[in-house]
């Protein structure tokens, strides 16, 4: 829907295992074994979750920020934590999930104060590799469908990712949303660095698949901030 349409991930109500309990992406980390841990794009148990150490937000996935896992904890030990949903407490923009920013200590929608239909969008960066087609999938065209799927197939009309079949997410293509494939390891993903930048895409990529998160490609670490390539990588 519209708020999430403008987010790069455009993910609502993810079906497990790609998403956790709806409405709780910012749950606190628990040290108890077997408790659900909201890491990256997948809820995992503490037993098999490997916290990703970080020094800055840019090193974390699209839906994460870099912070100490315990309140008032050792500032030297920081890991990637799940972003905070709208109306949750925050201290800086990066803590808020895509499409939101930190205002007066609360995550609020980035697009509350302007008409979201204005043509102010910029086309998502496109890279010269075989994963960089604007919509991220092949060009086959089927103009008629008599199949009545409960879950939408690739290219189907959707409002949220739960409308799409397994392995697909609901993401924006121009001014509407369709089911697109979840990104695989090595595929280019979108990492947002600017406040409000989540709303600037007319071709949204899906999020990275299970066990992957969107991180700077190792050989691009030396590149300038603006051109660093992000790809889906194993945790």
């Amino acid at each position: 829907t519209l708020n999430s349409v403008l987010n790069s991930n455009a993910i609502k109500n993810l079906p497990p295992p790609l998403g956790g309990a709806a409405g709780h992406p910012g749950s606190a980390v628990s040290a108890a074994p077997g408790i659900l841990y909201p890491g990256g794009n997948k809820y995992q148990t503490i037993d098999n979750y490997q916290p990703y150490p970080c020094a800055e937000d840019e090193e974390c996935g699209t839906d994460e920020y870099c912070a100490s896992p315990t309140r008032g904890g050792d500032a030297g030990v920081q890991i990637c934590l799940a972003c905070r949903k709208r109306r949750k407490r925050c201290m800086r923009h990066a803590m808020c999930c895509p499409g939101n920013y930190c205002k007066n200590g609360i995550c609020v929608s980035s697009d509350q104060n302007h008409f979201r239909g204005e043509i102010e969008e910029t086309i998502t960066e496109s890279f010269g590799n075989d994963h960089s087609t604007l919509d991220g999938y092949s060009r086959r065209t089927t103009l008629s469908s008599k199949m009545y799927h409960t879950k939408g197939q690739e290219g189907s009309v959707c409002l949220r990712s739960s409308d799409c079949a397994s392995g697909l997410c609901c993401a924006r293509h121009f001014w509407s949303k369709i089911c697109k494939p979840v990104l695989k390891e090595g595929q280019v993903c979108t990492k947002h660095r600017r406040k409000g930048s989540h709303g600037l895409e007319i071709f949204q990529r899906c999020y990275c698949g299970e066990g992957l998160s969107c991180r700077i490609q190792k050989d691009h670490h030396q590149a300038s901030n603006s051109s660093r390539l992000h790809t889906c990588q194993r945790h």
């Epitope: 829907t1 239909g117 919509d135 086959r140 469908s145 290219g155 009309v157 409002l159 509407s176």
Partner: antibody, heavy 117, light 107 residues
């Protein structure tokens, strides 16, 4: 400016099919999903389904149980809605409506389909 | 499917009155609510889109509020041209669903 022009009124017998067209202009047809909404006389609005012209992907309201088929012809920027096995309670005005970020912002003028024996 | 309960089903008010129409959804839809006005014999017109956003060209006397399950369309000062049926539409989850409509008349 954006315009959606629909085909004219139709009178059909129960059990027949009807195909309504919606010709779009004033914007790039493949960039927006096209929805179909119907309104029975004196009644409210009911979403039937939508089609995204980019790949022809569709989504339907399950209420219509396979009776509705949405198609597009990209070369003429035209969307079509075919409703089969018509019943008397399918008598309604059928609208096409352009999707804009989740809302339906521009609507066709409507096509009255009357089902009568 | 998400059910939308719109109230009142009809109302009569005087020019200049403040009018409110409510729409309650069967599940939390965040702020994914849209409001339409349909004048007699005319096509529905989008007034307010998701996030309580006033559409371009729509008079500022119209406003939308609410999130979660409770939503309100307010007309701050009723005008004669506002005689119409008003519909809410949720765009949070397929299938799209509309409220049953509120018929607004001038006293």
């Amino acid at each position: 400016q954006v315009q959606l022009v629909q085909s004219g009124a139709e009178v059909k017998k129960p059990g027949a099919s009807v195909k309504v067209s919606c010709k779009a202009s004033g914007y790039t047809f493949t960039e927006n999903t096209m929805h179909w909404v119907r309104q029975a006389p004196g009644q409210g609005l009911e979403w039937m389904g939508g089609i995204n012209p980019h790949k022809g992907g569709t989504s339907y309201n399950q209420k219509f149980k396979g009776r509705v088929t949405l198609t597009v012809d990209k070369s003429s920027s035209t969307a079509y809605m075919e409703l089969s096995r018509l019943r008397s309670d399918d008598t309604a005005v059928y609208y096409c409506a352009r999707d804009w970020l989740g809302a339906m912002d521009y609507w066709g003028q409507g096509t009255l389909v009357t089902v009568s024996s | 499917d998400i059910q939308l309960t719109q109230s009142p089903s009809s109302l009569s008010a005087s020019v200049g009155d403040r009018v409110t129409i409510t729409c309650i959804t069967s599940t939390d839809i965040d702020d994914d609510m849209n409001w339409y006005r349909q004048k007699p014999g005319k096509v529905p017109k989008l007034l307010i889109s998701e996030g309580n956003t006033l559409r371009p060209g729509v008079p500022s006397r119209f406003s939308g509020s609410g999130s979660g399950t409770d939503f309100t369309l307010t007309i701050s000062s009723l005008q004669p041209e506002d005689v119409a049926t008003y519909y809410c539409l949720q765009s949070d989850n397929l299938p799209y669903t509309f409220g049953q409509g509120t018929k607004l008349e001038i006293k």
